[in-house]
Interface confidence: low
Amino acid sequence: LQDLCSNCPAGTFCDNNRSQICSPCPPNSFSSAGGQRTCDICRQCKGVFKTRKECSSTSNAECDCISGYHCLGAECSMCEQDCKQGQELTKKGCKDCCFGTFNDQKRGICRPWTNCSLDGKSVLVNGTKERDVVCGPSPADLSPGASSATPPAPAREPGHSPQIIFFLALTSTVVLFLLFFLVLRFSVVKRSRKKLLYIFKQPFMRPVQTTQEEDGCSCRFPEEEEGGCEL
């Protein structure tokens, strides 16, 4: 009798009620291997799931997540809400990364900025909520006369007088200062609704929010359940 069942191909099941005849899988069920005594119910992609591949008599349906969600788990067993870059998903929804952390993806958690000094390097570009810091040469590499192995400075090319160099340096400083002022001004205006959270954040002071904002900071404090941000 077992031999009869082993002849049943994928897409069928060995029907004990019909003298071990191979019966096709009923609608919305499948068998992906031969010799099965039952067909498995097809996976249904409902709610936050959407169908990536329809179920057939020989293979299960495959699901994806609808827009605004991403798959978690093997075979997309769970859909998790997307957040913006610079945020992480908490029990209360999407929350901004705490100062000193970043998330460059729409999923996952905020991770601490790289500590450049651990590798003996200096910070070349400051970190943001969305981006890690960029580490540059070590401070020792930048300071003059730090290494006796430093090659001698090349002779100055004609035309590069000290006056021109001074003028260029001064111009650059003024331009950078103006840029910094504009960025700061823009930042203050943009974030006034957020109570200047990242500019004037005080340790362990919870920002007062008149409304529950979706993207308020997820800085969790010691008394909160989920473990605190180290400020």
Partner: antibody
Framework: EVQLLESGGGLVQPGGSLRLNCAAS????????MSWVRQAPGKGLEWVSA????????YYADSVKGRFTISRDNSKNTLYLQMNSLRAEDTAVYYC??????????????????WGQGTLVTVSS | EIVLTQSPGTLSLSPGERATLSCRAS???????LAWYQQKPGQAPRLLIY???SRATGIPDRFSGSGSGTDFTLTISRLEPEDFAVYYC??????????FGQGTKVEIK
Amino acid sequence: EVQLLESGGGLVQPGGSLRLNCAASGFTFSSYAMSWVRQAPGKGLEWVSAISGSGGSTYYADSVKGRFTISRDNSKNTLYLQMNSLRAEDTAVYYCARSYDKYWGSSMYSGMDYWGQGTLVTVSS
Amino acid sequence: EIVLTQSPGTLSLSPGERATLSCRASQSVSSSYLAWYQQKPGQAPRLLIYGASSRATGIPDRFSGSGSGTDFTLTISRLEPEDFAVYYCQQYYSYYPVTFGQGTKVEIK
């Protein structure tokens, strides 16, 4: 009854190759992702590799990436682990394990609920 | 990669006593993705708890799991002789790699 039976282990020299097999029965094999987990003598468990039910997605631990290849033949209900460029530190008992809940709507990782008895791989000159 | 640290390394207790095993994650893990296993010498691991607190099929109710975020606990309310073994926690969160804790050995005092 769900059963997983590993084979293919043995003694191999450093730099050599070996292919492990895991024969599955008692469940719809293609509906489950499968994993290989190893345990060096007297040590803890280390996840090695995993493969989705369809075989379309594979995952590896950094320690074996580029050397090991996981695959499956759903028509034969068999999981494989091809191990190349073997090193002494790959010496371990290798287990295959059924990895995830087949009830796909579940929002919960169901753990590795069934394991084989393991097969010993010894890499030594 | 998320690192799981189990404590204590060894727990010496007598049958009938309560065992509390700790598992701490290096970063927050969804409780849906934490499992506990028991392993006896010469045997394959056996799933005890999944989803941090759900008992696997056939596991006695003296085993219970709890915790969230970075701290998880496996409790054996009254140790039976067959419970003396090594216990591992395991996480699967934000895709692979899956990682295991280094294990806690529960031995007879």
